[in-house]
Interface confidence: low
């Protein structure tokens, strides 16, 4: 089998075997490597000579295979723009950001650029749990059958109607979507709205 | 030559205490992100927590965040691990490894020879 | 937290098989993925990362390839020095997590 061209070598065809680690050097019209990520080029190839390498500073990175001549500055989460740092930059990624609890992302430019806070789920309603947090803003849905949620809140969650048999009480009032059952004691006198009204 | 050197392990009972210490040689210990790595018997690789250059950083998994405490003196080219209310669970090699990516780590490149700990009544 | 699966967890060669080992992560990690070599009785050995960057003295009949979620680490024509456990890691967001390990036995 042919031997596999060790970098530089001469390609008239503008393509070189290796579209990841290597580039097309056109003044020389010859095959590169390119750098490997968390490195940049410190000096460029030549006809007798591969790119030399070199390590990206602190506080930089560069994240893929690259014949660029710097590495990238690491920029922090801004909380001002409500992000929180996941994990920090290293050499061969950029900080990970995410929105900060509470918020959803407003702009996406590749990455969030802008989270604004979730709006709230009014009272009887709760937001539709999303498979990523921090995605989009809240969907308000109605409470299902037998819940009942009694607040304005971005997170707060339906929660069951009270069994007031379970309590060894019996129902005064019926829940709502908006409110609990309303248990009393059974030798309790019926409140005066409910009067005449025979409790089963 | 790099090097990383870990002592301080032993036998403890459960609940109780340990600091392990891992001495660098070698390199600028100060540039480097480090980190501890942990292994129990016949099972595989448990990454347990990682500390940045200047030890303003610190990062835990959940297994033993609030537990343990990851820690550096740069004066001394030391890495710490102090290990509080130990589980049996607990039990296993616990390696320091320094991370090639300068002060802020994601790729072990130099790793201890490892150090046993072992929690047990 | 993000986990790692790798496949086969154990497998027999010869001498000069092609070896492939599969790692796949829970959700996507780009190319943030390392492999290690460990033999028994010792510490890990950073083979590759980056997914694909060789580390600087590992033999190139060591590869690795893959980005997202799917992740590929080749042994070209397996050598004796070659039979051990391999792990591959993620490095996403913390806490990173290492796969449980693939175990490369001589048949």
């Known amino acids: 089998s042919q031997p596999q061209a060790v970098p530089p070598y001469a390609s008239e065809n503008q393509t070189c075997r290796d579209q990841e680690k290597e580039y097309y050097e056109p003044q020389h019209r010859i095959c590169c490597s390119r750098c490997p990520p968390g490195t940049y080029v410190s000096a460029k190839c030549s006809r007798i000579r591969d790119t030399v390498c070199a390590t990206c500073a602190e506080n930089s990175y560069n994240e893929h295979w690259n014949y660029l001549t710097i590495c990238q500055l690491c920029r922090p989460c801004d909380p001002v723009m409500g992000l929180e740092e996941i994990a920090p930059c290293t050499s061969k990624r950029k900080t990970q950001c995410r929105c900060q609890p509470g918020m959803f992302c407003a702009a996406w430019a590749l990455e969030c650029t802008h989270c604004e806070l979730l709006s709230d789920c009014p009272p009887g309603t709760e937001a539709e749990l999303k498979d990523e947090v921090g995605k989009g803003n809240n969907h308000c849905v109605p409470c299902k059958a037998g819940h009942f949620q009694n607040t304005s809140s971005p997170s707060a969650r339906c929660q069951p109607h009270t069994r007031c048999e379970n309590q060894g009480l019996v129902e005064a009032a019926p829940g709502t979507a908006q409110s609990d059952t309303t248990c009393k004691n059974p030798l309790e006198p019926l409140p005066p709205e409910m009067s005449g009204t025979m409790l089963m | 030559e790099v090097q990383l050197l870990e002592s301080g392990g032993g036998l403890v009972q459960p609940g109780g205490s340990l600091r392990l210490s891992c001495a660098a040689s070698?390199?600028?210990?100060?540039?480097?992100?480090m980190t501890w790595v942990r292994q129990a018997p016949g099972k595989g690789l448990e990454w347990v927590s990682e500390?940045?250059?200047?030890?303003?950083?610190?990062y835990y998994a959940d297994s033993v965040k609030g537990r343990f405490t990851i820690s550096r003196d740069n004066s001394k080219n030391t890495l710490y691990l102090q290990m509080n209310s130990l589980r049996a669970e607990d039990t296993a090699v616990y390696y320091c490894?320094?991370?090639?990516?300068?002060?802020?780590?994601?790729?072990?490149?130099?790793w201890g020879q490892g150090t046993t700990v072992t929690v047990s009544s | 937290d993000i986990q790692m699966t790798q496949s086969p967890s154990s497998l027999s060669a010869s001498i000069g098989d092609r070896v492939t080992i599969t790692c796949r992560a829970s959700?996507?990690?780009?190319?943030?993925l390392n492999w290690y070599q460990q033999k028994p009785g010792k510490a890990p050995k950073l083979l590759i990362y980056?997914?694909?960057a060789l580390q600087s003295g590992v033999p190139s009949r060591f590869s690795g390839s893959g980005s997202g979620t799917d992740f590929t680490l080749t042994i070209s024509s397996l050598q004796p020095e070659d039979f051990a456990t391999y792990y591959c890691q993620h490095y996403k967001s913390y806490p990173y997590t290492f796969g449980q390990g693939t175990k490369v036995e001589i048949r």
């Open positions: 490894a320094k991370d090639d990516d300068g002060a802020y780590g994601d790729t072990m490149d130099v």
């Open positions: 959700q996507d990690i780009s190319n943030y």
């Open positions: 500390i940045s250059g200047s030890g303003g950083s610190t």
């Open positions: 980056a997914a694909s």
């Open positions: 070698g390199f600028t210990f100060s540039n480097y992100a």
